[in-house]
Each structure stands twice: as structure tokens, then as C-alpha cells.
């Protein structure tokens, strides 16, 4: 049995990848910043994890996926003010009792050092200095992700 | 260029509903939030409310039991409703682009609407 | 009564600094790097001038300068140009998704 968490982040992955896939993304669109092969927006306003998972879809992008340690500590290098947290793509799949990213991998246990329960209706968020478990509910910002993905690098069929 | 056009009716009477939209053209619809912002003749800007393309909204609290925004996407367009409107809502109406929820950084060129019998 | 408060008109003449203060409460200028300038000539809709405090968009020359310290934020004007001459409007985010605006300075170039 999938929470209502779950489903939506299921349906929204899924609507993404039946899009049509578009050509590489060069430079980060403005207000975005580039994080090595990544752009990162920052949200200003404050939302429940559902509401910026769907916000970060619309705007052809997902909540932030972090892939190590390494990454994390850039990405809170980002952040200006100690006392802000912020949404990533990682919530607690109760069917499976772990810690799910939204592209449906699993956390691996040594990547992140969360702060809190892992239990139903949790997300993750991040500050500056550390990696929360918080109840989804909250209202806090988030932050969105694209893939810099350079066009000389994609191969299409039938080119 | 994105641009941004107001439109709706110029007089409306007291106690009825103020209605307009905004229709953008030149950029990406869904990738931005979307606001309403007024100008008293003479006066301050005053923000009214936001629209996130994935359908939330967000509200002044001092208007927000009269305002409702909501957006078509098919049209790239969103709209404003204000009820019982009163001749303190007699201003310039704005709809702007919200980036990232707290700063405007294209606007329509306004569009004036007077509350009168 | 706005929620932020800027002084009602500065003046300068050609070539001098201008600096218009706005200044508001930890729960809007002094709570959040969200602060914003806005340029309105008469009869015409409002330009953003400065974002984030300090960030300047493309296009708006960098005679314009904006900065912030504790509860008060600033726009700096130098070399002052006729075409400055406007109102100005500061702008925060104050918290619960909400925005806030100064009740506008009117900049008048001598």
C-alpha cells in the first residue's frame, strides 16, 4: 500500500519520462546555478514536500537528487543562511520501510546522516550544516534540479 | 521578450466582481509564478496574490478572503477575481512575473479599473 | 501605512550619489536576503532595478547598487542621470509566501 506521498511522486516521475525528451541543457536558465553538471534553483517561498515536488516538475525539472557526501557539502556551500531548510527529492517509503529517492533508487545508508525519524509521511531536507528528517506537512522551501547535459554528448536514434 | 497584457473591464460597481487576465506570451508559461499587484492613484504598489503553474496559490492575508487567482495553461493565461469590491479597490493593476516568489521582474503595462455605481 | 517605510522624496543633482533607505522589521528586510528595487516613471509600469539585495538584472546599468544592514535596506544612485528621475519602490519577502512594499520615494534630479 503506497502512502499518498509516494503516489504522487510516482505520478509526477512518470509524466516526466513520458515527455518527449528535449535537447541538452548548455547553461543553467537564469536565477539557476550551476553546481558542476547541475543547475540548482533555490526556492524563495515555502511549501509542503508534495507542493515543490510538483513545483520542481512543472518546471521541467525534479527536486534535488543528491548523489554523495561530496555533493551535499556543495550544495550546502550554496546556502546562505544557517537557519533555512530546504526540500530535496528524498522521502520515507513505508512499503518498503527506507529512505526512497524520486527516481526510485534507495538512500545508501553511508551517504547522508539524517537527523530524525525514519517513519511514514517523513521528507528530508537539508540546511547549511546538516540533513533532517521532517514531516512532510512542513512548509519550507525546496530546491529544484536540471541535468547540464551538453548536446555534443547525447546520441539520438536516427540521426 | 516575454510580455505581459491585462485585460478585463475598465468600471465595475460596488459589492460586485472585479475580474481580469493576463495573458503572457514569449516565454516559458510553466516555469515561473505568477503574480497581481496594484497602485492606488498616487499611491504604493500593493501585492494581491501568486500563482504557482502547478495550481497552489498564495494570497496577501489582508485581501486573501476576497481574492481568487487561478490560470489556464493551455492559453498561458491567469486570472484575477476580487469580490465585493468597494471604491478603495479603484487602482492600476498589474500582473508581473514572480521567478522565485519575492521579487517582479516583468510586468504588463497595468490596467486601470474604477469601482463606481 | 506600508509595511515598509522610505522617505517620501531625495534629490541630487547630475553626476552626484542618491541613496534611498527602506527600512522595515526582522520579519521582512532584516529576516530574508529577498529584498528588491523597483523604477516607475509616470504613467508606466513599474522596472525591477535590483533583486536579492544586491543583484542587478541584465540591462540595469551598475550605477545602481542596492545593500542591506539589519533592518534597513539602501539603493545607491550614482553619477545621477536626468532620466533617474522617478519613483522608486522598495520591495521584501516577509515571510508565509508574502511580499511587501515601501511607500515609494519620488527621486528628483536638480
Known amino acids: 500500500q503506497k502512502s499518498s506521498i509516494e503516489k504522487c511522486s510516482v505520478d509526477i516521475q512518470q509524466s516526466r519520462n513520458k515527455t518527449t525528451e528535449r535537447p541538452g541543457l548548455l547553461n543553467c536558465p537564469i536565477y539557476w546555478q550551476q553546481l558542476r553538471e547541475k543547475c540548482l534553483l533555490f526556492s524563495h517561498t515555502v511549501n509542503p514536500w508534495n507542493n515543490s515536488l510538483a513545483d520542481c516538475s512543472t518546471k521541467e525539472s525534479s527536486l534535488l537528487l543528491i548523489r554523495d557526501k561530496d555533493e551535499l557539502i556543495h550544495t550546502q556551500n550554496l546556502i546562505r543562511d544557517k537557519a533555512i531548510l530546504f526540500w530535496i527529492g528524498l522521502n520515507f517509503s513505508l512499503s518498503e520501510k527506507n529512505w526512497k529517492w524520486i527516481n526510485g533508487s534507495f538512500l545508501n545508508s553511508n551517504d547522508l546522516e539524517i537527523r530524525g525519524d525514519a517513519k511514514e509521511n517523513s521528507c528530508i531536507s537539508i540546511s547549511q550544516t546538516s540533513v533532517y528528517s521532517e514531516y512532510c506537512s512542513t512548509e519550507i522551501r525546496w530546491i529544484c534540479q536540471k541535468e547540464l547535459t551538453p548536446v555534443r554528448n547525447k546520441v539520438y536514434p536516427d540521426s | 521578450q516575454v510580455q505581459l497584457q491585462e485585460s478585463g473591464p475598465g468600471l465595475v460597481k460596488p459589492s460586485e466582481t472585479l475580474s481580469l487576465t493576463c495573458t503572457v506570451s514569449g516565454d516559458s508559461f510553466s516555469s515561473y509564478y505568477w503574480s497581481w499587484i496594484r497602485q492606488p492613484a498616487g499611491k504604493g504598489l500593493e501585492w494581491i496574490g501568486r500563482?504557482?503553474?502547478?495550481?497552489?496559490?498564495n494570497y496577501n492575508p489582508s485581501l486573501k478572503s476576497r481574492v481568487t487567482v487561478s490560470v489556464d495553461t493551455s492559453k498561458n493565461q491567469f486570472s484575477l477575481k476580487l469580490n465585493s469590491v468597494t471604491a478603495a479597490d479603484t487602482a492600476v493593476y498589474y500582473c508581473a512575473r514572480d521567478p522565485l516568489g519575492s521579487f517582479f521582474d516583468y510586468w504588463g503595462q497595468g490596467t486601470l479599473v474604477t469601482v463606481s455605481s | 501605512q506600508s509595511a515598509l517605510t522610505q522617505p517620501p522624496s531625495a534629490s541630487g543633482s547630475p553626476g552626484q550619489s542618491v541613496t534611498i533607505s527602506c527600512t522595515g522589521t526582522s520579519s521582512d528586510v532584516g529576516g530574508y536576503n529577498y529584498v528588491s528595487w523597483y523604477q516607475q516613471h509616470p504613467g508606466k509600469a513599474p522596472k525591477l532595478m535590483i533583486y536579492?539585495?544586491?543583484k542587478r538584472p541584465s540591462g540595469v546599468p551598475d550605477r545602481f547598487s542596492g545593500s542591506k544592514s539589519g533592518n534597513t535596506a539602501s539603493l545607491t544612485v550614482s553619477g545621477l542621470q536626468a532620466e533617474d528621475e522617478a519613483d522608486y519602490y522598495c520591495s521584501s519577502y516577509a515571510g508565509s509566501n508574502n511580499v511587501v512594499f515601501g511607500g515609494g520615494t519620488k527621486l528628483t534630479v536638480l
Open positions: 500563482l504557482y503553474t502547478s495550481g497552489s496559490t
Open positions: 536579492e539585495v544586491s
